[in-house]
């Protein structure tokens, strides 16, 4: 990996739990300042593999609200606007990091958690299983 | 919002920075134990809106490696395997949380950061722009 010289101004790390436990500033810095939020807002409806977005809320998690996609159809929408079962709508999934309150109900103590979320759907050619 | 009774076993939070700065355990708990990692591994090639995955590495970020999708075509792949410009391949983007080392190069001090990543591509009907 890449070795980075340590900044002498770092907070003290003489903690028996270090490096497992770190300090995190929850004032979120948003790097997405110049992107248009409306740009992809209607893809879920215009896609040939349309999806619905479902709200997943968990107060013990940060962020507490995550939106999950569910494909509307098994097949994909063809040029006539009908479902074509020669193709499949499948969810595109991504592993993301969230913070889980640990111990539970604690406002200032968390553990990193990896969860798999469905972000949207795409239309794929099915894998053909040949019967012997 | 939902009010949660505070756990009396929580770490001490009498810190002038609280609640902005919290303790986070970096021992990641993976909730995806029963998912098949190969399940969506070939969607990028089988999709009608195929994409390539690009490695984005930043040692000042946690996770340091993020994979970003880029659509291969402006149009979508039709039943004959050719690009059809009556449809458009578009990236499905998601805002995710990452940890940014702050101050820089510090191993145990981070700030939450929101970044926009492209997870995959989907095929959509284009918005028709009428020329006067």
């Amino acid at each position: 990996g890449i070795t980075i010289p340590r900044n002498p101004g770092c907070p003290n790390s003489e903690d028996k739990n270090f490096p497992r436990t770190v300090m995190v500033n929850l004032n979120i810095h948003n790097r997405n300042t110049n992107t248009n939020p409306k740009r992809s807002s209607d893809y879920y409806n215009r896609s040939t593999s349309p999806w619905n977005l479902h709200r997943n809320e968990d107060p013990e998690r940060y962020p507490s609200v995550i939106w999950e996609a569910k494909c509307r159809h098994l097949g994909c929408i063809n040029a006539d606007g009908n479902v074509d079962y020669h193709m499949n709508s499948v969810p595109i999934q991504q592993e993301i990091l969230v913070l889980r309150r640990e111990p539970p109900h604690c406002p200032n103590s968390f553990r990193l958690e990896k969860i798999l979320v469905s972000v949207g759907c795409t239309c794929v050619t099915p894998i053909v299983h040949h019967v012997a | 919002g939902i009010t949660i009774p505070r756990n009396p076993g929580c770490p001490n939070s009498e810190d002038k920075n609280f609640p902005r700065t919290v303790m986070v355990n970096l021992n990641i708990h993976n909730r995806n134990t029963n998912t098949n990692p190969k399940r969506s591994s070939d969607y990028y090639n089988r999709s009608t809106s195929p994409w390539n995955l690009h490695r984005n590495e930043d040692p000042e970020r946690y996770p340091s490696v993020i994979w970003e999708a880029k659509c291969r075509h402006l149009g979508c792949i039709n039943a004959d395997g050719n690009v059809d410009y009556h449809m458009n391949s578009v990236p499905i983007q998601q805002e995710i949380l990452v940890l940014r080392r702050e101050p820089p190069h510090c191993p145990n001090s981070f700030r939450l950061e929101k970044i926009l990543v492209s997870v995959g591509c989907t095929c959509v009907t284009p918005i028709v722009h009428h020329v006067a």
Partner: antibody
Framework: QVQLVESGGGVVQPGRSLRLSCAAS????????MHWVRQAPGKGLEWVTL????????LYGDSVKGRFTISRDNSKNSLYLQMNSLRAEDTAVYYC?????????????WGQGTLVTVSS | SYELTQPPSVSVSPGQTASITCSGD??????VSWYQQKPGQSPVLVIY???RRPSGIPERFSGSNSGNTATLTISGTQAMDEADYYC???????????FGGGTKLTVL
Amino acid sequence: QVQLVESGGGVVQPGRSLRLSCAASGFAFGSYTMHWVRQAPGKGLEWVTLISFDGRSKLYGDSVKGRFTISRDNSKNSLYLQMNSLRAEDTAVYYCARGSVRGEAAFDLWGQGTLVTVSS
Amino acid sequence: SYELTQPPSVSVSPGQTASITCSGDNLRTKYVSWYQQKPGQSPVLVIYQDTRRPSGIPERFSGSNSGNTATLTISGTQAMDEADYYCMTWDVDTTSMIFGGGTKLTVL
């Protein structure tokens, strides 16, 4: 020899029409998306239009929509650009270009260009 | 509509490294290609898909794309590299190909 050769340029009055041709040789013309790109004198490149390998789908830049029509004849290895209602701002060198098989954001072969001058 | 912005000119001494930038909103999510055009000649593809070099293009030409900026880098610049350089991508919203305004590279 892999090449593209444009023809059909010339001087034309505003409001009139002109048809450009592009002859391809040395490669499987019918397998490629083809484009027209133009360059006004002393200016930069401007994408004009594209046509899919089979001629079924076409896209046009906003400045030529409704006036220009792209077409192709794969049996003759030829690409065409029918330009109607020409304007002074259409004056440019017109290039035909081949789209890369690896995706549209690359034109891997260009012709030598043909000059179109719209003037009264 | 989507725009790609390039500096009008860049100067470099022979043997030095020239960097030509191309900026656009969230450009890292798109593929960028680069074209070299010498006076009186047709454009030539020098970089495609951000970083790839077509056969026949010297190794001194390289490309990158991150954030809002794609960069064409010419290391060990030679007098023969003096030309106009254009970046290009596509825009889904207008379903069109977009060229940058072009950068004139001068080898001093």
